[in-house]
């Protein structure tokens, strides 16, 4: 806290300019008018203030706007944004995407801070849903943003926003998140033709049910092993050997290298050994000939 002292003669700031970098903290407090600062916030970012000095400028703005800064000031905070606490940001009402972009730019190249997380939360809640432009902006700055949301939060993403999602944006998503995103993606891309559809839907297939995988197997999609390994185990288990062969196309040979890993391992255990042998890959662990397979889960569902 800077103690209140009178401004030395001739030092009263007439405008926000570079001369202020030579002011000591107490001089900034005494000689810079908060209202002047608020109207000339756009200049602050271009001036090489230390963070110590920015602390003083923040204090002045806090006194001027105890209920929270207006958006006209927020948009021009620049590096001063880094001095804000989540509590400060919760007082704001940020509605402009341009304001959001300006503040995210300040933190660019750095991991998401609590300030940024709070800002995004305020912005998205203010909009009511995660629209395409917002999602586009957020994933451009933070590719992992989408996967940081809970399934409940993801449910507010409209299918139209899915067009903004890039494969790398889904890298850290878990199955629960993909379960929510996949139906939205399916809806968003439903009017595309086969091969184009597969390119777009591929990153979301970790949330696909068995019937959709069966449908894809009829379309010569040649799914790569990396995508196959991310599929839901419960969705893969009911697929027949013929269906997996069609689904993977030339990539089917990769099953051998993955035979000890899920979902391939569990899928092998569910297949007849005779059927596995038709692949000619030497996959072992299938059901021996003459054994009867009872699907107990189906029986339970019927009773």
């Amino acid at each position: 806290e800077v103690e209140k002292t009178a401004c030395p003669s001739g030092k009263k700031a007439r405008e926000i300019d570079e001369s202020l970098i030579f002011y000591k903290k107490w001089e900034l407090e005494a000689c810079v008018d908060a209202a002047l600062l608020a109207t000339q916030m756009d200049r602050v970012n271009a001036i090489p203030f230390t963070y110590e000095q920015l602390d003083v400028l923040k204090h002045k703005l806090d006194e001027l706007y105890p209920q929270g800064y207006p958006e006209s000031v927020i948009q021009h905070l620049g590096y001063l944004f880094l001095k804000m606490s989540p509590e400060d940001i919760r007082k704001w009402n940020v509605t402009s995407l341009e304001t959001l972009k300006a503040l995210l730019e300040v933190n660019k190249g750095h991991e998401m801070s609590p300030q940024v997380a709070t800002l995004i939360d305020r912005f998205v809640k203010g909009r009511g849903q995660l629209d395409k432009d917002t999602l586009d902006t957020l994933t451009a700055f933070y590719p992992g943003y989408l996967c940081s949301l809970s399934p409940e939060e993801l449910s507010s993403v409209p299918p139209s926003s899915i067009w903004a999602v890039r494969p790398q944006d889904l890298d850290t998503c878990d199955p629960r998140q993909l379960d929510v995103l996949y139906p939205k993606a399916r809806l968003a891309f439903q009017n595309m033709n086969g091969s184009e559809y597969f390119v777009k839907i591929q990153s979301f297939l970790g949330g696909a049910p068995t019937e959709d995988l069966k449908a894809l197997s009829q379309q010569n999609v040649s799914m790569d092993l990396a995508t196959f390994m991310k599929l839901r185990t419960d969705a893969v288990l009911p697929l027949t050997v013929a269906e997996v062969q069609k689904l993977l196309g030339p990539h089917v040979e990769g099953l051998k290298a993955e035979e000890r890993h899920r979902p391939v391992r569990d899928w092998i255990l569910r297949q007849r050994q005779d059927d596995l042998d038709t692949l000619g890959l030497g996959l072992q662990g299938g059901i021996p000939n003459g054994y009867l397979v009872l699907d107990l889960s189906m029986q339970e569902a019927l009773s």
Epitope: P48, F49, T50, Y51, E52, Y79, L82, N107, H110, S113
Partner: nanobody
Framework: EVQLVESGGGLIQPGGSLRLSCAAS????????MGWHRQAPGKERELVAT???????YYANFVKGRFTISRDNSKNTLYLQMNSLRAEDTAVYYC?????????WGQGTLVTVSS
């Protein structure tokens, strides 16, 4: 984190010259601007000169025309060339880097101007 180590201080006669160096290490990519500050005995620390990442320089009135701030990006080093030194320039000189999201300071180097 950014680490700063100053060197080059010492005892010098009035009218003489000295060159201070400040070697930066650590997360130097996050540095926005750097500066030299000084603190004379019994006085507040004051800014002497600042240089931005694009090379724009700013000088306090009391050193204009006598001191020159510069940086060698290939060596990650900040310099302060001090000419026409006066007794009132006697102080501990500190290197400062303003980086995301705080100010980093060196330990200081003492410059004594005396005959």
């Amino acid at each position: 984190e950014v680490q700063l180590v100053e060197s080059g201080g010492g005892l010098i006669q009035p009218g003489g010259s000295l060159r201070l160096s400040c070697a930066a290490s650590g997360n130097i990519g996050s540095i926005r601007h750097m500066g030299w500050h000084r603190q004379a005995p019994g006085k507040e620390r004051e800014l002497v000169a600042t240089i931005t990442t694009v090379g724009t320089t700013y000088y306090a009135n009391f050193v204009k025309g006598r001191f020159t701030i510069s940086r060698d990006n290939s060596k990650n080093t900040l310099y302060l060339q001090m000419n026409s030194l006066r007794a009132e320039d006697t102080a501990v000189y500190y290197c400062r880097a303003t980086a995301h999201p705080t100010d980093y300071w060196g330990q200081g180097t003492l410059v004594t101007v005396s005959s």
